[in-house]
């Protein structure tokens, strides 16, 4: 769920998601449209696709709570929960490390980006 994602992103990137990523660009945060603005925004667009796939599989992406371990900079998704919980953790782990990989190109100007400026084709999944 959202609480899992926020905690994981903070642990992996060292940034407060609510201040740094939700929202950011055209796809980080609720919703998403248009062409992603940079690599960080692409991480979020890919994560949206990951969630969309789980929704088609009947998973409650915002309600499902999963367990994971964070140690020595790595995330280990627990294999104890349901299929949905494990897949949700995998989606969130991927976006957390994607955001970390792209910290060097993070642009403060894209925080709280005005969504009407998000134009172009929204990438397919």
């Amino acid at each position: 769920g959202i609480l899992n994602l926020n905690k994981m992103v903070k642990q992996v990137t060292g940034k407060m998601p609510i201040l740094s990523y939700w929202p950011y660009g055209c796809h980080c945060g609720l919703g998403g449209r248009g062409q992603p603005k940079d690599a960080t925004d692409w991480c979020c667009q890919t994560h949206d696709c990951c969630y969309d796939h789980l929704k088609t599989q009947g998973c409650s992406i915002y309600k499902d709570y999963y367990r994971y371990n964070f140690s020595q900079g790595n995330i280990h998704c627990s294999d104890k929960g349901s299929w949905c919980e494990q897949q949700l953790c995998a989606c969130d782990k991927e976006v957390a490390f994607c955001l970390k990989r792209n910290l060097d190109t993070y642009q403060k100007r894209l925080r709280f980006y005005w969504r009407p400026h998000c134009r172009g084709q929204t990438p397919g999944c």
Epitope: G58, S60, D64, S78, D79, K80, S82, W83, C84, E85
Partner: antibody
């Protein structure tokens, strides 16, 4: 050979606490990913999952019964316990413990079951 | 929670007859699991991850399905197949079982 065996009081009165023990062999509850669950079956009826406990003491409960259930383990004695508080006649059933192997979403080995009757 | 509805609840089949037991999920699931239970015995894992036979299960059994519709099939009924069969999911919490199908020998 993996085996599990349940034990319980047999008969108890309404409003009492039901205490069940699952004694197992052939695997260790210290193995990463390993879990043991409890399932019950009223006579002539279907199966109902109650709770799981895992190697790292993580516990999962059926939400409809969560307030009445407590699962625990004694790893050194290869035992898992289940307590159900405030029982009534609807808790009369055969109670099974079963192993959930690492990375699986089902119970691969089951105990023989113990019958519990709650009298009013 | 995901509700699993099995049909039929009770059925009978003659030796050699093809048998199909259905399990319908209230929402989509990734895999279905099946158990066989004979009177006075505990359930035995029978089919895992929708179509894989558990150890010792005769090849006349098969499992199939996707989404919300799953089934267990016996290609040719034998006397020893008379039992109750239960489907189970752990796609999402909590883990749930179907109410069971009782298969009798005609």
């Amino acid at each position: 050979q993996v085996t599990l065996k349940e034990s319980g009081p047999g008969i108890l009165q309404s409003s009492q606490t039901l205490s069940l023990t699952c004694s197992f062999s052939g695997f260790s509850l210290t193995t990463s990913g390993m879990g043991v669950g409890w399932i019950r079956q009223p006579s002539g009826k279907g199966l109902e999952w109650l709770a799981h406990i895992y190697w790292d003491d993580d516990k999962r409960y059926n939400p409809s019964l969560k307030s009445r259930l407590t699962i625990s383990k004694d790893t050194s004695r290869n035992q898992v316990f289940l307590k159900i508080t405030s029982v009534d006649t609807t808790d009369t059933a055969t109670y099974y413990c079963a192993r959930r192997g690492p990375g699986t979403w089902y119970f691969d080995v089951w105990g023989t079951g113990t019958t519990v009757t709650v009298s009013s | 929670q995901i509700v699993l509805t099995q049909s039929p609840a009770i059925m009978s089949a003659s030796p050699g007859e093809k048998v199909t037991i259905s399990c319908s999920a209230s929402s989509s699931v990734s895999y279905m699991y099946w158990y066989q239970q004979k009177p006075g015995s505990s359930p035995k894992p029978w089919i895992y991850r929708t179509s894989n036979l558990a150890s010792g299960v005769p090849a006349r059994f098969s499992g199939s399905g996707s989404g919300t519709s799953y089934s267990l099939t016996i290609s040719s009924m034998e006397a020893e197949d008379a039992a109750a069969y239960y489907c189970q999911q752990y796609h999402s919490s909590p883990l749930t079982f179907g109410a069971g199908t009782k298969l009798e020998l005609k």
